[in-house]
């Protein structure tokens, strides 16, 4: 058993049929010595008396808010949560496996630039009685500070018969140099509590590996005389690290119709303009990627050909 | 500790081309190592990230773009002084700071070159003959060093009398390649910045 936060405790249980469970001793936070009784949740049934209460925690029915009273007055609470371990593996029931970039990916993180700011998100099908707490650091043995905000519900989607909820959090490394060469990864830890179930999820990464620039901005077309060709130009996104001559991007320019199966024109360039063949009912799209360290491509910025 | 804006014209900057080749060569070599050594811990997640140049050179700080010198977090206290006469520079326009940056890059390359050559000598003794260093990568390191043209003491190649542990050598190769790729990215950024300034 360990303390998650004040008056909230996590009981780690090996979860299998007829498991013996864990013996837990609760102590009432009071100078009083006698006349103390214990109850669980909203029940008025007295579970025991005395300053301490010893319980055998085996299942979720044994978890919850234990309260010690004296003469009708509440003295203190202890909330017990369960963390299940099945076949030596901690449960991951609360969050959905996003399976990208690999299986067992519950947290996904992205950074728009090298400033040390990044966003992580996760998915769940649970809509109520759900809380998250996020901590982060650079390295784990001698951790350096990373400050994370509160996790918020950022999107809701319907997937077949299920609703899916996306939560996200923004974090900022306290003293980040955009030009630094990372040798210690960022660690992100998410505590998830659903009703009386506790789970924790972690992700470890270098900012350089989670870079995904914003799409290029200000796409403009200029038809070329006596030709099917069009000159398309764009600018670096505002959120990209500066100076751009140091933090350079490379671009992919594509002309394609509405369907992915349609024919297309595609060219890669390090410049902020390119010449492509425009077709009726097609769109010109441009996306960006760090020129020197191939992490993710940005989303496409698009303009119609016409 | 930063790069001034007054830097050479693009035409006078042959190092950019060499640094691009360097990044390409080390990336290819790392990819080859990951594939060949698939049953060794050779991915970014599996290895310890070590920097053999730590406390010996200060390339990131010495080559910091002017725009980032206002960022307190970028101003590390490490200082190293180097010989200052590089041929990638249009000499009259060169500042002391830029020479410091380029000589720091030169020292990095020299250190990695020695490590890689020592390692290759060990790998050549491996009866499995599983992996060797790409000669193209070693050649590209050499070309960039020549383009930088700094005179410095030659570092003797480390020779070891004991039997090499090939497993450890291959893991060390992965560690070195990962670190060198990150440094090659920095070098490429620096050359691009100098070329554009």
């Amino acid at each position: 058993i360990w303390e998650l936060k004040k008056d909230v405790y996590v009981v780690e249980l090996d979860w299998y049929p007829d498991a013996p469970g864990e013996m837990v001793v609760l102590t009432c936070d009071t100078p009083e010595e006698d006349g103390i009784t214990w109850t669980l949740d909203q029940s008025s049934e007295v579970l025991g008396s005395g300053k301490t209460l010893t319980i055998q925690v085996k299942e979720f029915g044994d978890a919850g808010q234990y309260t010690c009273h004296k003469g009708g007055e509440v003295l203190s609470h202890s909330l017990l949560l369960l963390h299940k371990k099945e076949d030596g593996i901690w449960s991951t029931d609360i969050l959905k496996d996003q399976k990208e970039p690999k299986n067992k990916t519950f947290l996904r993180c992205e950074a728009k630039n090298y400033s040390g700011r990044f966003t992580c998100w996760w998915l769940t099908t649970i809509s109520t009685d759900l809380t998250f707490s996020v901590k982060s650091s650079r390295g784990s043995s001698d951790p350096q500070g990373v400050t994370c905000g509160a996790a918020t519900l950022s999107a809701e989607r319907v997937r077949g018969d299920n609703k899916e909820y996306e939560y996200s959090v923004e974090c900022q490394e306290d003293s980040a140099c955009p030009a630094a060469e990372e040798s210690l990864p960022i660690e992100v830890m998410v505590d998830a509590v659903h009703k009386l179930k506790y789970e924790n999820y972690t992700s470890s990464f270098f900012i350089r590996d989670i870079i995904k620039p914003d799409p290029p901005k200000n796409l403009q077309l200029k038809p070329l005389k006596n030709s099917r060709q069009v000159e398309v130009s764009w600018e670096y996104p505002d959120t990209w690290s500066t100076p751009h001559s140091y933090f350079s991007l490379t671009f992919c320019v594509q002309v394609q119709g509405k369907s992915k199966r349609e024919k297309k024109d595609r060219v890669f360039t390090d410049k902020t303009s390119a010449t492509v063949i425009c077709r009726k009912n097609a769109s010109i799209s441009v996306r960006a990627q760090d020129r020197y360290y191939s992490s993710s491509w940005s989303e496409w910025a698009s303009v119609p050909c016409s | 500790r930063n790069l001034p804006v007054a830097t050479p014209d693009p035409g006078m900057f042959p190092c950019l081309h060499h640094s691009q080749n360097l990044l390409r060569a080390v990336s290819n070599m790392l990819q080859k190592a990951r594939q060949t050594l698939e049953f060794y811990p050779c991915t970014s997640e599996e290895i310890d990230h070590e920097d053999i140049t730590k406390d010996k050179t200060s390339t990131v700080e010495a080559c910091l773009p002017l725009e980032l010198t206002k960022n307190e977090s970028c101003l590390n206290s490490r200082e190293t002084s180097f010989i200052t006469n590089g041929s990638c520079l249009a000499s009259r326009k060169t500042s002391f700071m830029m020479a410091l940056c380029l000589s720091s890059i030169y020292e990095d390359l020299k250190m990695y070159q020695v490590e890689f050559k020592t390692m290759n000598a060990k790998l050549l003794m491996d009866p499995k003959r599983q992996i060797f260093l790409d000669q193209n990568m070693l050649a590209v390191i050499d070309e960039l060093m020549q383009a930088l043209n700094f005179n410095s003491e030659t570092v003797p190649q480390k020779s070891s009398l004991e039997e090499p542990d090939f497993y450890k050598t291959k893991i060390k190769l992965c560690i070195l390649l990962h670190a060198f790729r990150i440094r090659a990215v920095t070098i490429d950024r620096v050359m691009s910045y100098l070329n554009a300034s």
Epitope: R228, E262, R266, R279 | -
Partner: antibody
Framework: QVQLVQSGAEVKKPGSSVKVSCKAS????????LHWVRQAPGQGLEWMGW????????EYAPKFQGRVTITADESTSTAYMELSSLRSEDTAVYYC???????????WGQGTLVTVSS | DIVMTQSPLSLPVTPGEPASISCRAS??????LHWYQQKPGQAPRLLIY???QSISGVPSRFSGSGSGTDFTLTISSLQPEDFATYLC?????????FGQGTKVEIK
């Protein structure tokens, strides 16, 4: 299986024209760009131009501009390349090639040898 | 026009050994470079597109690398059927242009 089948070899006199055909099978004809590329004996490849069979749009290499015409007939899934004012240096194998991507070629015809000789 | 220069023009290789062919562009073409194999009397066959992207059905011993002006096609271990001419092609701008070809011959 996508295939491009070209017309047979031709012998032409200098100053005349030649029209080579390229019939496509497998896949929808208008879903692909179609190019013509030639190869003189013992020489490299030389791109001549492309057509979008969907709308008849064409683009020609400046070297052949005014002398080459690429057309397409959707009803027969056939593309044509006509080269006029032939000279001896036009002796080459002429290939048609196609792709959904405009700028490179994933399927090629077998080639048509055009010999220009007086 | 962008001029593509291949080297060497002829490359004698022992079967089973690796081979590397170089292609250089007269100006930077990013990764807009494609590789083809051509055997005598046959049409070219696409091997690699956009410098390093592999084609399904092409053996994994063929790989490509490079960007900007310098590109390499590598055959990790030459098989008897690999003795042919290899051509690079740029697609950075029209007109599309090809290298003059590298003939890989049996040593």
């Amino acid at each position: 299986q996508v295939q491009l089948v070209q017309s047979g070899a031709e012998v032409k006199k200098p100053g005349s024209s030649v029209k080579v055909s390229c019939k496509a099978s497998g896949g929808t004809f208008s879903d692909y760009y179609l190019h013509w590329v030639r190869q003189a004996p013992g020489q490299g490849l030389e791109w001549m131009g492309w057509i979008d069979p969907e709308n008849g749009d064409t683009e020609y290499a400046p070297k052949f501009q005014g002398r080459v015409t690429i057309t397409a007939d959707e009803s027969t899934s056939t593309a044509y390349m006509e080269l006029s004012s032939l000279r001896s240096e036009d002796t080459a194998v002429y290939y048609c090639a196609r792709n959904k991507e405009l700028r490179y070629f994933d399927v090629w015809g077998q080639g048509t040898l055009v010999t220009v000789s007086s | 026009d962008i001029v593509m220069t291949q080297s060497p023009l002829s490359l004698p290789v022992t079967p089973g050994e690796p081979a590397s062919i170089s292609c250089r562009a007269s100006q930077s073409i990013s990764i807009n470079l494609h590789w083809y194999q051509q055997k005598p009397g046959q049409a070219p066959r696409l091997l690699i597109y956009f410098a390093s992207q592999s084609i399904s059905g092409v053996p994994s011993r063929f790989s490509g690398s490079g960007s900007g002006t310098d590109f390499t096609l590598t055959i990790s271990s030459l098989q008897p059927e690999d003795f042919a001419t290899y051509l690079c092609q740029q697609s950075n701008s029209f007109p599309l242009t090809f290298g003059q070809g590298t003939k890989v011959e049996i040593k």
